[in-house]
Interface confidence: low
Amino acid sequence: EEELQVIQPDKSVLVAAGETATLRCTATSLIPVGPIQWFRGAGPGRELIYNQKEGHFPRVTTVSDLTKRNNMDFSIRIGNITPADAGTYYCVKFRKGSPDDVEFKSGAGTELSVRAKPSAPVVSGPAARATPQHTVSFTCESHGFSPRDITLKWFKNGNELSDFQTNVDPVGESVSYSIHSTAKVVLTREDVHSQVICEVAHVTLQGDPLRGTANLSETIRVPPTLEVTQQPVRAENQVNVTCQVRKFYPQRLQLTWLENGNVSRTETASTVTENKDGTYNWMSWLLVNVSAHRDDVKLTCQVEHDGQPAVSKSHDLKVSAHPKEQGSNTAAENTGSNERNIY
């Protein structure tokens, strides 16, 4: 009869953590008679995984009925795999003997790799908005991966960031690992459309890294600039005063007109125009009837943006000037809302 060979047809098996690994082993002959044992590792320090003849191995089941004399399939399944199970498994045929069976021939070994994918990275930014030129911190977390080796990169609009700190926990052996990274980002006025990306590369992802993103639109506040201008209107004794609110983000904005310190009208930004950089512009106007006033009028455009302290810009209407040229006083016609397209 042909010499017995112990065939482990799979050089390697890749199993996800928590699943069952099937390790295949067959013999080419029924003789010599004797049991099979499975070991992890080779040499004197090898670890017994399964003994056909004796012992209790609750995580191990055999593929075939090893009690049948004509069985030549010594494959096993190991349940609930963890990364600690990684290693090379040898199927070893023993020659029956007394008092001990004698090792006869070993299979070539099957390398079991246990891999768990990292979870999708979650990127979180600061709790409160910040203005340009400020530095804000973003965190990125991903969990449940194995092996421990992992690469994390940060990008802002495709440009790699360098100011970040990363930790992989735990430091020692574990079933799975987590990564936590904090990156510092300096905001600019152009960052409304910007994105911060955390990219995680791991052996389980086969060169296709996972990405988590955060939009800086959730983080940035660009305060508005104000400009108050006066324009004559065709009608006698009327002056149109406009307040240009430029380059602000987010849209949440309330504008109040004051005449000599007294509230004349309050309105909320609604129909805004969007700039290419994602910021907004808005304009409010006030139609002023100057004929009823002898004294100069101080008009103030006061803007409260995104819950921040109000900013304002004032404009003096000179009553002495000819109405058609400059306009003068302010029995302001507070008639309704801002109709932007009046001129």
Partner: antibody, heavy 120, light 107 residues
């Protein structure tokens, strides 16, 4: 090129046995698993088992363990499947299949199939 | 053993159409799924293995996708030679088991 040659037809009586062959050529016979598949008339494919010619190692689906015996003859690069205690339920086309992917459970090359008729 | 459930059992379509056949495994088989085509009176032919890899010589109008327990085979722009029976088969064995098949007929 890889080829698997099977006899076109076998006719046997109920209760008898049949040993059908699958002759391989065009590749290293002992390096790749050979799988056997059953297809009853108008029905789907049913995996019976496979054998590793390099070792004679076999796998069977449970329902065929007592029905089908898989063997190989490496000297003639031929795989055999013996079906025992035949009944009309065993009337079917039997395919052998192999290929470079056979270790990984897919089969690139198929024989033409042997039509087995069990009839008295 | 892992059971494979294929749907639909039968499908009629016209030349030029796009069709999708699905296959469900009774347990996680990762990406270890193959697809075969079989024409009347002929042997099966491998189309796709490991869920999405096209076998040699298979036209690019065929594409496989899926992982875990849910898989599909998509055929774009059906050609007359595409009509026949299609089978999925899990590779996560042995034993390996086939789906019950999908018959693709000309409308």
């Amino acid at each position: 090129q890889v080829q698997l040659q099977q006899p076109g037809a076998e006719r046997v009586k109920p209760g008898a046995s049949v040993k059908m062959s699958c002759k391989a050529s065009g590749y290293t016979f002992t390096s790749y698993w050979i799988t056997w598949v059953k297809q009853r008339p108008g029905q789907g494919l049913e995996w019976i088992g496979d054998i590793y010619p390099g070792s004679g190692s076999t796998n069977h689906i449970e329902k065929f363990k007592s029905k089908a015996t898989l063997t190989v003859d490496t000297s003639s690069n031929t795989a055999y499947m013996q079906l025992s205690r035949l009944t009309s339920e065993d009337s079917a086309v039997y395919y052998c299949a192999t290929g470079y992917g056979s270790s990984y459970g897919y089969f690139d090359y198929w024989g033409q199939g042997t039509t087995l008729t069990v009839s008295s | 053993d892992i059971q494979m459930t294929q749907s639909p059992a039968s499908l009629s379509a016209s030349v030029g159409e796009t069709v999708t056949i699905t296959c469900r495994a009774s347990e996680n088989i990762y990406s270890y799924l193959a697809w075969y085509q079989q024409k009347q009176g002929k042997s099966p032919q491998l189309l796709v293995y490991t869920a999405k890899t096209l076998a040699e010589g298979v036209p690019s109008r065929f594409s496989g996708s899926g992982s875990g327990t849910q898989f599909s085979l998509k055929i774009n722009s059906l050609q007359p030679e595409d009509f026949g029976n299609y089978y999925c088969q899990h590779q996560y064995g042995p034993p390996f088991t086939f789906g019950s098949g999908t018959r693709l007929v000309i409308k």
